[in-house]
C-alpha cells in the first residue's frame, strides 16, 4: 500500500479503507520492542473492546511498522465513531489512540485502465477503466494525468486534470456547426478536408475531459503522438471522505495522425454515396475505413467497428497533381460519419490517420457550374450562371477567378451568397481566362468546392478602360 499518501495525516495511528467495507490501521515505532508488545484495541460506542490482529514490518534505519487489517467485514461500520487505541502489553502504556469514522478515511485502490485508444476526432483519446470496488464508484471522483511519451525526453510535460463526470461526451455533439456563416459567405468552416486550428503544444494543453462511469474522453492532444496516462480516484467528499489513492500503472497509447496531413477529402453528390480521397504516399499502400455513429450522449460502447471503404481505381490526371487513392461507401443521413485511413509502409508499419467526423449534409459537393458571358461594352462583361442545385440556391456561394493571357496569377472574386450573375470590368483589347466554382455553405448544407469550370476564354473589344 502506498501509505506515503497519508503523509498529511498528523495522527500517529493512521487508518484507511480501500472499499469502505475494509479497514487497515498502522503506526510506526522507533523503539525496538519484542514481537507481541502491542495490541490494537477497538470499540464502537457501548460495545466491548476487541483486539485487531497485528503484523509487523521492520523498516531499516527507522524502526517497526505495525499493521492491522480488520479481520471481519462486519466490524467495519460506516457513520459510527470507532475508538482505537494501542496498548503496550509489557509496559503500562497506551501508545496512541484516536476516534474515527470509517466513511472519512477512504484511500481507494487505483482503477485499472483497460482500454486506451484514439477518440472520434483527431487529437482525441478515449479511455475506459475498471473500478476495483464498483459498488463505490458513484462516490468517487477521478483524476487523470498524462503526457507525451518521448523516448528522448522522459520528463516531458505532464497534464493533471480532474475528470468531470457530469459533462457529456463532446465528440458526440453535432460536429462543426456552420458558425462560419458569420464571416464572409465562402469562409471555410473547419471540415474534414481542411486544416483545422493548430493544436497547442502539450505543455500548454488545456485539454477537455469528460467521463461517463468508467470511461472518459480527452481532447486537444497532438494527433500522431504517443502518450502515457494514469488514473487515480478519491472519495467525493460528499457521501464519503478520504484521500487520493495511488496512481494506476501507466498505459501508453499511440494516437492516429490527422488525416488532413494526407489531404483527405470526403463528399457526396447524391446524399447517399460518399466518396473519400487522399494523397497516395510513396512506397506505401493505403486503405480507407468508415463507421456511422448516432448522436447520443455518452454511450456505453464507444469502441466502433470500422468497415472497409470500397476502393476505386487510383487516378493520376496529370504530372502536376498528386496521385489520389479513392474509396466509396453508402451512407445515411441520420448518423455521423467517421473516416480512418491506414497507410502501410514498405517495411509493414501501419500508420493510422483519422478524419474529423461529419454528417452527410456537411459534405455535399456540387456539380461544376456553367459560366455564360456577354460583353456589354468594351471590357464590360455581364456574367450569368445556373445554380447547380436549385434546391439549395440560397446556400450556394461562388468563386470566380480570372487571369490575363500569359499570366500565372489569378484574381479571385466572391459574388454575394445566392447571386445568379454579376458584372466584370476588364482591360479592353485583352485576352482572359475565366473560371467559376460553387459550394454549399448554409445552415442546412455544406460541402467542399466543386471543380473549377472549364476555362472560358474572353477577348475584350477595343477602347473602354476598366
Amino acid at each position: 500500500q502506498d501509505v506515503s499518501l497519508l503523509a498529511s495525516d498528523s495522527e500517529p495511528l493512521k487508518c484507511f479503507s480501500r472499499t469502505f467495507e475494509d479497514l487497515t490501521c498502522f503506526w510506526d515505532e522507533e523503539e525496538a520492542a519484542p514481537s507481541g508488545t502491542y495490541q490494537l484495541l477497538y470499540a464502537y460506542p457501548r460495545e466491548k473492546p476487541r483486539a485487531c490482529p497485528l503484523s509487523s514490518q521492520s523498516m531499516p534505519h527507522f524502526g517497526t511498522r505495525y499493521v492491522c487489517q480488520f479481520p471481519d467485514q462486519e466490524e467495519v461500520r460506516l457513520f459510527f465513531p470507532l475508538h482505537l487505541w494501542v496498548k503496550n502489553v509489557f509496559l503500562n502504556q497506551t501508545r496512541t489512540q484516536r476516534v474515527l469514522f470509517v466513511d472519512s478515511v477512504g484511500l481507494p485502490a487505483p482503477p485499472s485502465i483497460i482500454k486506451a485508444m484514439g477518440g472520434s476526432q483527431p487529437g482525441e483519446l478515449q479511455i475506459s477503466w475498471e473500478e476495483p470496488a464498483p459498488e463505490i464508484s458513484d462516490f468517487l471522483r477521478y483524476e487523470l494525468r498524462y503526457g507525451p511519451r518521448d523516448p528522448k525526453n522522459s520528463t516531458g510535460p505532464t497534464v493533471i486534470q480532474l475528470i468531470a463526470t457530469e459533462t457529456c461526451c463532446p465528440a458526440l455533439q453535432r460536429p462543426h456547426s456552420a458558425s462560419a456563416l458569420d464571416q464572409s459567405p465562402c469562409a471555410q468552416p473547419t471540415m474534414p478536408w481542411q486544416d483545422g486550428p493548430k493544436q497547442t503544444s502539450p505543455s500548454r494543453e488545456a485539454s477537455a475531459l469528460t467521463a461517463e462511469g468508467g470511461s472518459c474522453l480527452i481532447s486537444g492532444l497532438q494527433p500522431g503522438n504517443s502518450y502515457w496516462l494514469q488514473l487515480r480516484s478519491e472519495p467525493d467528499g460528499i457521501s464519503l471522505g478520504g484521500s487520493w489513492g495511488s496512481w494506476s500503472l501507466p498505459v501508453t497509447v499511440d494516437l492516429p495522425g490527422d488525416a488532413v496531413a494526407l489531404g483527405l477529402q470526403c463528399f457526396t453528390l447524391d446524399l447517399k454515396n460518399v466518396t473519400c480521397q487522399w494523397q497516395q504516399q510513396d512506397h506505401a499502400s493505403s486503405q480507407g475505413f468508415f463507421y456511422h455513429s448516432r448522436a447520443r450522449c455518452c454511450p456505453r460502447d464507444r469502441y466502433p467497428i470500422w468497415e472497409n471503404c470500397e476502393e476505386e481505381e487510383k487516378t493520376n490526371p496529370g504530372l502536376q497533381t498528386p496521385q489520389f487513392s479513392r474509396c466509396h461507401f453508402k451512407s445515411r443521413n441520420d448518423s455521423i460519419i467517421h473516416i480512418l485511413v491506414e497507410v502501410t509502409t514498405a517495411p509493414g508499419t501501419v500508420h493510422s490517420y483519422l478524419g474529423s467526423p461529419f454528417w452527410i449534409h456537411q459534405a455535399v459537393r456540387l456539380p461544376t457550374p456553367n459560366l455564360h458571358w456577354r460583353e456589354i461594352s468594351s471590357g464590360h462583361l455581364e456574367l450569368e450562371w445556373q445554380h447547380p442545385s436549385s434546391w439549395a440556391a440560397q446556400e450556394t456561394c461562388y468563386q470566380l477567378r480570372y487571369t490575363g493571357e500569359g499570366h500565372q496569377d489569378w484574381k479571385v472574386l466572391e459574388p454575394p451568397l445566392g447571386a445568379r450573375g454579376g458584372t466584370l470590368e476588364l482591360r479592353p483589347r485583352s485576352r482572359y481566362r475565366l473560371q467559376l466554382r460553387a459550394r454549399l455553405n448554409g445552415p442546412t448544407y455544406q460541402g467542399p468546392w466543386s471543380s473549377w469550370s472549364d476555362p472560358t476564354r474572353v477577348e475584350t473589344a477595343t477602347e473602354t478602360a476598366w
Partner: antibody, heavy 118, light 107 residues
Framework: DVQLQESGPGLVKPSQSLSLTCTVT?????????WNWIRQFPGNKLEWMGY???????DYNPSLKSRSSITRDTSMNQFFLQLNSVTTEDTATYYC???????????WGQGTSVTVSS | DIQMTQSSSSFSVSLGDRVTITCKAS??????LAWYQQKPGNAPRLLIS???SLETGIPSRFSGSGSGEDYTLTITSLQTEDVATYYC?????????FGGGTKLEIK
C-alpha cells in the same frame, strides 16, 4: 530504588513441586513493567522461564509450559513461580528480573539456588 | 525457538586489549538484542539493549553493533573489572533465549 529478592527451598525432592517467591521493593508490580523468572544451570546456561505483566497476563517458555505457573499477590507486591514434577534437570540458580522500558532485563534479584535431589 | 550462538566460550585477553565478542541468531531478530555481564556469584547485569543502546551507568568503552542475525559486543580497552562472562539475549520473540556465554580470562 527497585530491588528484587528471590526466596524458596534450597532442596526439593524429584517429582515434587518447586515454589519460589520474588519480593519487589521500591516499585508496585501492578503499576507497570513485566516481571520474569530466569534460571541458570550449573554449566552457566541461562533459560527464560516466563513472565507476569503489570496487568496480570502471563507467558511461558513452551518447554516448561505444561508444568509451570506464574502468579502474584498484589497486596504483598510479590510474584511467584511454581514448577511441578521436578527432576534433577531442574537443579539451577533461579532469578527474578524486571523487563524494563527498553524490553531488556534491567533489574535482577541475587538469585536463589535450588537443588533437586532425593 | 531462536538459537543464540556465541562462537567462543572463553577468551584469554590482556588488560588494555580491544575485545570483540560475537553473537549469532538463528534468524533475523531485528536488533532486539541485549548484552549482559555476569561476575562469579552475582546476577547478570544489563549493559546494552536494542543491539547498540548503552544503559545508564555503563562505561563508554562498551559498545554494541550489528543487525539481522549477527551482533557484536566491543570493549575498546579491557580493564580489570571487565573480567567476567558475557551473554547475549534475543527478545524478538518468546521464548526469549540467551547465548551460551563468553568468558574473559586474563593471560
Amino acid at each position: 530504588d527497585v530491588q528484587l529478592q528471590e526466596s524458596g527451598p534450597g532442596l526439593v525432592k524429584p517429582s515434587q513441586s518447586l515454589s519460589l517467591t520474588c519480593t519487589v521493593t521500591g516499585y508496585s508490580i501492578t503499576i507497570d513493567y513485566t516481571w520474569n523468572w530466569i534460571r541458570q544451570f550449573p554449566g552457566n546456561k541461562l533459560e527464560w522461564m516466563g513472565y507476569i505483566t503489570y496487568s496480570g497476563s502471563t507467558d511461558y517458555n513452551p518447554s516448561l509450559k505444561s508444568r509451570s505457573s506464574i502468579t502474584r499477590d498484589t497486596s504483598m507486591n510479590q510474584f511467584f513461580l511454581q514448577l511441578n514434577s521436578v527432576t534433577t534437570e531442574d537443579t539451577a540458580t533461579y532469578y527474578c528480573a524486571r523487563l524494563g522500558r527498553r524490553y531488556a532485563l534491567d533489574y535482577w534479584g541475587q538469585g536463589t539456588s535450588v537443588t533437586v535431589s532425593s | 525457538d531462536i538459537q543464540m550462538t556465541q562462537s567462543s566460550s572463553s577468551f584469554s585477553v590482556s588488560l588494555g586489549d580491544r575485545v570483540t565478542i560475537t553473537c549469532k541468531a538463528s534468524e533475523d531478530i531485528y536488533i532486539r538484542l541485549a548484552w549482559y555481564q555476569q561476575k562469579p556469584g552475582n546476577a547478570p547485569r544489563l549493559l546494552i539493549s536494542a543491539a547498540t543502546s548503552l544503559e545508564t551507568g555503563i562505561p563508554s568503552r562498551f559498545s554494541g553493533s550489528g543487525s539481522g542475525e549477527d551482533y557484536t559486543l566491543t570493549i575498546t580497552s579491557l580493564q580489570t573489572e571487565d573480567v567476567a562472562t558475557y551473554y547475549c539475549q534475543q527478545y524478538w520473540t518468546t521464548p526469549w533465549t540467551f547465548g551460551g556465554g563468553t568468558k574473559l580470562e586474563i593471560k
